[in-house]
């Protein structure tokens, strides 16, 4: 995940972090009527050897972790990404100013894992 | 994905990279009979604004990209992770030295995206 971050300290393990997103902050307040925002959350943290059960790692991620240990210059660690996502319902104006209620898939992170 | 890398230059966009994994290199040659290795591949690259169609981005990744632009110190970019994974069949010795043929899921990266 945070590929452009440099940190001299050990990062925490891959996990879900809370994040509230305000549609006003995104500049979407003129077309989204409701909600005003939502708990989107995000994934961040290290996917380091050994990958434990909490990390929901795929078989590929386990293999990639081992290859990274041997070839860190060439192959990155797996990354911390959503494993479960939920939808939210949004009330908004379409291009013709009609009010629409639509369910947007994959908007909320419920769980994270190493991929 | 390569969260512990520092790079002074622009990284290429999220994509699949070829990677052949030798079971001998992993130290698994004593229990895996066949194959000797396989094309595992891996995902790497930037998930930067704007996320184009090739990046198979989820709605959450699109939102997270916008939040990252506004708050890069707090929220990372989405990460480049597998979106399609394939299985491989492996012939191996179990703990009782029986020869087993088993299909291992999620071993090969077929496609990558921003998550």
């Amino acid at each position: 995940s945070a590929s452009d971050y440099n940190s001299s300290e050990l990062k925490t393990a891959c996990r879900k972090h809370e994040l509230y997103v305000s549609f006003q902050d995104l500049g979407w307040q003129d077309w989204i009527i409701a909600p005003k925002g939502y708990a989107a959350n995000y994934c961040d943290g290290e996917c380091s050897f050994p990958l434990n059960a909490h990390m929901n790692a795929t078989n590929h991620a386990i293999v990639q972790t081992l290859v990274h240990l041997m070839n860190p210059e060439y192959v990155p660690k797996p990354c911390c990404a959503p494993t479960k996502l939920n939808a939210i319902s949004v009330l908004y104006f379409d291009d013709n100013s009609n009010v629409i209620l639509k369910k947007y898939r994959n908007m909320v992170v419920r769980a994270c894992g190493c991929h | 994905s390569a969260s512990d890398y520092n790079s002074s230059e622009l990284k290429t966009a999220c994509r699949k990279h070829e990677l052949y994994v030798s079971f001998q290199d992993l130290g698994w040659q004593d229990w895996i009979i066949a194959p000797k290795g396989y094309a595992a591949n891996y995902c790497d690259g930037e998930c930067s604004f704007p996320l184009n169609a090739h990046m198979n981005a989820t709605n959450h990744a699109i939102v997270q990209t916008l939040v990252h632009l506004m708050n890069p110190e707090y929220v990372p970019k989405p990460c480049c992770a597998p979106t399609k994974l394939n299985a491989i069949s492996v012939l191996y010795f179990d703990d009782n030295s029986n020869v087993i043929l088993k299909k291992y899921r999620n071993m090969v990266v077929r496609a990558c995206g921003c998550h």
Epitope: H68, L69, M70, N71, P72, E73, Y74 | A2, Y5, N6, S7, S8, E9, K11, T12, S22, D25, G27
Partner: antibody, heavy 118, light 107 residues
Framework: QVQLVQSGAEVKKPGASVKVSCKAS????????IHWVRQAPGQRLEWMGW????????KYSQKFQGRITITRDTSASTAYMELSSLRSEDTAVYYC???????????WGQGTLVTVSS | EIVMTQSPATLSVSPGERATLSCRAS??????LAWYQQKPGQAPRLLIY???TRATGIPARFSGSGSGTEFTLTISTLQSEDFAVYYC?????????FGPGTKVDIK
């Protein structure tokens, strides 16, 4: 044939910086990583950091984090290691070494002696 | 971090004799072990990799063996040019680490 040729010896004052170069020839520069290893007088070899010459990714030893910068110029097939805030214990021979995927350090530069003295 | 230890620290051998150098890893490193030779004022030179494979141009008198945590470098018949310091290095798990070296000197 593969060669890594390093810049010449340097004498620096405490607090100064040094930049050592490592020019590669005889192979495709961007297909390998360049590592930097140092050896203080009578000491064992100590890994400092690496750069993937293809994509520019770097990784530094925790010991040198914040003081070391490794860069490369692909057009010149040259890698550079800069060490800042030098102290007397940084007096050592600094080596660059090439590493391919799944391999050890197969070719080394001749070494650059850096002496830190007031 | 995997710690590499070497023994003996110094080995005194006469030219023409056999030299056996040992290297131990603090945990299993499969066969990902290399041996380097370093002469005074020179850079290390790769001798053996993958525990037992000789690098390009390395004479047959150098051989490597072992697996897991215990490794050996053998110089079957010591030549005058073989008196040097020998380092082992594991390249199985990052960070790759070197042993402290074994100095082979003339008896």
């Amino acid at each position: 044939q593969v060669q890594l040729v390093q810049s010449g010896a340097e004498v620096k004052k405490p607090g100064a910086s040094v930049k050592v170069s490592c020019k590669a020839s005889g192979y495709t520069f961007t297909s390998y990583a360049i590592h930097w290893v140092r050896q203080a007088p009578g000491q064992r070899l100590e890994w400092m950091g690496w750069i993937n010459a293809g994509n520019g990714n770097t990784k530094y030893s925790q010991k040198f984090q914040g003081r070391i910068t490794i860069t490369r110029d692909t057009s010149a097939s040259t890698a550079y290691m800069e060490l800042s805030s030098l102290r007397s214990e940084d007096t050592a021979v600094y080596y660059c070494a090439r590493r391919g995927f799944g391999e050890p350090f197969d070719y080394w530069g001749q070494g650059t002696l850096v002496t830190v003295s007031s | 971090e995997i710690v590499m230890t070497q023994s003996p620290a110094t080995l005194s051998v006469s030219p023409g004799e056999r030299a056996t150098l040992s290297c131990r890893a603090s945990q299993s490193i499969s066969s990902n072990l290399a041996w380097y030779q370093q002469k005074p004022g020179q850079a290390p030179r790769l001798l053996i990799y993958g525990t037992s494979t000789r690098a390009t141009g390395i004479p047959a008198r150098f051989s490597g063996s072992g697996s897991g945590t215990e490794f050996t470098l053998t110089i079957s018949t010591l030549q005058s040019e073989d008196f040097a310091v020998y380092y082992c290095q594991q390249y199985n798990i990052w960070p790759f680490t070197f042993g402290p070296g074994t100095k082979v000197d003339i008896k």
